[in-house]
């Protein structure tokens, strides 16, 4: 669709005569008829296939024609067409004399024709005017013409309809060739697809307007490249949505069970060595001079009774000093000047000569120790109680007082709440410090797996095209993570193909 525009500029008829040579009375009141038609090698009469237009009387004899386009007038003359411009044309311009006010062809005598010109040729669509002048023996006509496209039509032959728009069916303006030019932030064949925030994850993010990044279920972050871990995951991470992969030292379904109490809580004091011995369980190995479950108690260096053979211990700033009884010497009174003849063995110990009588050794009865059997045995010195148990001397024997959750002679056994198989429907039992926890199989929940729930939403393999299925345990629904090139809640539809017409 376009318009052939003809701008009449000047008509010269100095003698004021008709084509027959007869003069006009009183002068030639001149108007024009224009016929636009398809290209003819020899322009002949016949239908004006591209259109016709007539002017009112524009002047008498010779006159210049005013450009009236700005005032809504008729110059340039408009010959609209509703077809593809063929690039060639034929044009007939007739100048007529109007004796009266009726300009209809049937109201005029045939000899009212002043002049007739006919041209033909090629004409491309464009803004530039082509200037032409046609001269006959008595008249001269100067004019220019061009073809331009109608509003919203584009291209070399005005055949491409394009209307700029900025709504949800497109965000574009039209290029000179009629192709769409997307507004900033939009893309796609019809510029209806927003360009998401730069870096927004191709599969896990999307947008409904430019520079936006909305996350699909299971993803978060400014660019939707961070997975959302399982609801309730405490000390864990994920690489795909709804996972809970435990950090080092943590365990359990929600990574909330402390498997590394030593590192996380540093319970041992005074430089003691900490050893993990189970969930929330540990043992402290104290440095010399300290005692207690957490080695929090400072010992006097004399508390370990370092002086032998009845020597008395004196604490000093830099250690201790043994005061030896008569007949003994050495740092710990360990050397004797006595022999068996001096009856050095106490508490019924029997004496044995050594080194040809120069020395001796006492063999002590049960419950006594020391080089002279002078010490009652403290069965707790070897710290035999595990898992923080407290050692108690009980006459000839010893016993361990265990912390909650432990039993056995040396508190070496973990009290198992799981022994009675409390988890129903094949649930797995986990001992905790203050009780137990059941990990339930798919389809069951509750503290003891006693509640039947819906089965794993991914069990039926609902995702297509090799998509990864994630079960959202909080809602018992599934989420499909589509591979590149597929969309849809089940990844069932390929993207990038042009939509097909329904007919």
């Amino acid at each position: 669709s376009g318009v052939f525009q003809l701008q009449l500029q000047e008509f010269i008829n100095e003698r004021g005569v008709l084509a027959s040579g007869r003069p006009c009375e009183p002068g030639c009141r001149t108007f024009f008829r224009v016929c636009l038609k398809h290209f003819q090698a020899v322009v002949s009469p016949g239908p004006c296939t591209f259109g016709t237009v007539s002017t009112p009387v524009l002047g008498t004899n010779s006159f210049a024609v005013r450009d009236d386009s700005s005032g809504g007038g008729r110059n340039p003359l408009q010959l609209p067409f509703n077809f593809t411009w063929p690039g060639t044309f034929s044009l007939i311009i007739e100048a007529w004399h109007a004796p009266g006010d009726d300009l209809r062809p049937e109201a005029l005598p045939p000899d009212a024709l002043i002049s007739k010109i006919a041209i033909q040729g090629s004409l491309a669509v464009g803004q530039n005017w082509l200037l032409d002048e046609q001269t006959s023996t008595l008249t001269r006509l100067r004019y220019s013409y061009r073809v331009i496209c109608s509003d919203n039509y584009y291209g070399d032959n005005c055949s491409r309809l394009c209307k700029k728009r900025n709504d949800h069916f497109g965000h574009y303006v039209c290029q000179p060739d009629g192709n769409l030019s997307c507004l900033p932030g939009w893309t796609g064949e019809y510029c209806q697809q927003p360009i998401c925030l730069s870096g927004c994850h191709e599969q896990n993010g999307y947008c409904s307007k430019p520079a936006e990044c909305l996350c699909r279920p299971g993803w978060q972050g400014r660019l939707c490249n961070e997975c959302i871990p399982h609801n309730g995951c405490r000390h864990g991470t994920c690489s795909t949505p709804w996972q809970c992969t435990c950090d080092e030292g943590w365990g359990g379904l929600f990574c909330d069970q402390d498997l590394n109490y030593c590192t996380h809580h540093s319970p041992c004091k005074n430089g003691a060595t900490c050893s993990n011995s189970g969930q929330r369980s540990y043992t402290c190995t104290c440095r010399p001079g300290y005692t207690g479950v957490d080695c929090e108690l400072e010992l006097s260096e004399c508390d370990s009774n370092p002086c032998r053979n009845g020597g008395s211990c004196k604490d000093q700033e830099d250690g201790y000093h043994c005061l030896c009884p008569p007949g003994y010497y050495g740092l710990h009174c360990e050397h004797s000047t006595l022999s068996c003849a001096d009856s050095p063995c106490f508490n019924g110990g029997s004496c044995r000569e050594r080194n040809q009588g120069a020395n001796y050794a006492c063999e002590c009865p049960p419950n006594f120790t020391g080089s002279n059997c002078e010490k009652k045995v403290d069965r707790c010195t070897s710290n035999p109680c595990a898992n923080g148990g407290q050692c108690l001397n009980r006459g000839p024997s010893r016993m361990c007082r265990c912390r909650p959750g432990f039993t056995g002679t040396y508190c070496e056994l973990h009290v198992s709440d799981c022994a009675r198989n409390p988890c129903a429907h094949g649930g797995t039992c986990h001992d905790l410090e203050n009780g137990l926890m059941c990990t339930c199989p798919a389809g069951f929940s509750g503290r003891r797996c006693e509640v039947r729930t819906s089965i794993d939403a991914c069990a039926s393999s609902p995702c297509f095209n090799r998509a990864t299925c994630y079960t959202d345990l909080s809602t018992d629904t599934f989420v499909c993570n589509c591979p590149y090139g597929f969309v849809g809640s089940r990844c069932e539809f390929p993207v990038g193909l042009p939509p097909s017409f329904p007919w």
């Epitope: 497109g170 307007k209 849809g488």
Partner: antibody, heavy 121, light 106 residues
């Protein structure tokens, strides 16, 4: 061949909420090339566009109804829904769902058969 | 709000041409669609993008749109063309329908 089918109650009491669902078969609602619209027609009157939605949930509403309208989409069920709150007798109409095609410059090439909703106590 | 105005009714003899107009401010700068609706039936798209026909729509239906007016023309009208006709355009993000024209084939 794409087909659309409206469903929902045919009678709603004044001041209550009108709820309708459109089920799409023979094609996917999850395409960037389409919007899914609701249009209504009071008895003996002309067509009135209510609003539309795409598969991502972007919605557009008629300004004259915007305060009362909610349109949502469920791609897993290939459905989209209309809720119109605080209804009056003036909301009595045949309600149509339709597919609006980007290629057709927003023209609606497929329509449901329509469902008459009467607002009356 | 944007309005599209149509004549309430148009009468035409069989075999003649019926022209239905649709007027709106600068409508020529928007894409016009036309729908045919017969009693008790859903609307059917007969023209989109001003002048294009969906497949299955007879060639006697044609459309044009310029200035403030879009026109649906039915050449060689047949009795089966008797129906209500609605024009439609988009004003920003809102769909707008004309008031409808009843075409009667005499």
């Amino acid at each position: 061949e794409v087909q659309l089918q409206e469903s929902g109650p045919g009678l709603v009491k004044p001041s209550e909420t009108l709820s309708l669902t459109c089920t799409v078969s023979g094609g996917s609602i999850s395409s960037s090339g389409y919007y899914w619209g609701w249009i209504r027609q009071p008895p003996g009157k002309g067509l009135e566009w209510i609003g539309d939605i795409n598969y991502r949930g972007s919605t557009y509403y008629n300004p004259s109804l915007k305060s009362r309208v909610t349109i949502s989409v469920d791609t897993s069920k290939n459905q989209f829904s209309l809720k119109l709150s605080s209804v009056t007798a003036a909301d009595t109409a045949v309600y149509y769902c339709a597919r609006e095609d980007v290629i057709l410059r927003g023209g609606s090439d497929y329509w449901g058969q329509g469902t008459l909703v009467t607002v009356s106590s | 709000s944007y309005e599209l105005t149509q004549p309430p009714s148009v009468s035409v003899s069989p075999g003649q041409t019926a022209s239905i107009t649709c007027s709106g401010q600068r409508l020529g700068d928007k894409y016009a669609s036309w729908y045919q609706q017969k009693p008790g039936q859903s609307p059917v798209l007969v023209i989109y993008e001003d002048s294009k026909r969906p497949s299955g729509i007879p060639e006697r239906f044609s459309g044009s749109n310029s200035g403030d007016t879009a026109t649906l023309t039915i050449s060689g009208t047949q009795p089966m063309d008797e129906a209500d006709y609605y024009c439609q355009a988009w004003d920003r993000d809102t769909g707008v329908f004309g008031y409808g024209t009843k075409v009667t084939v005499l």
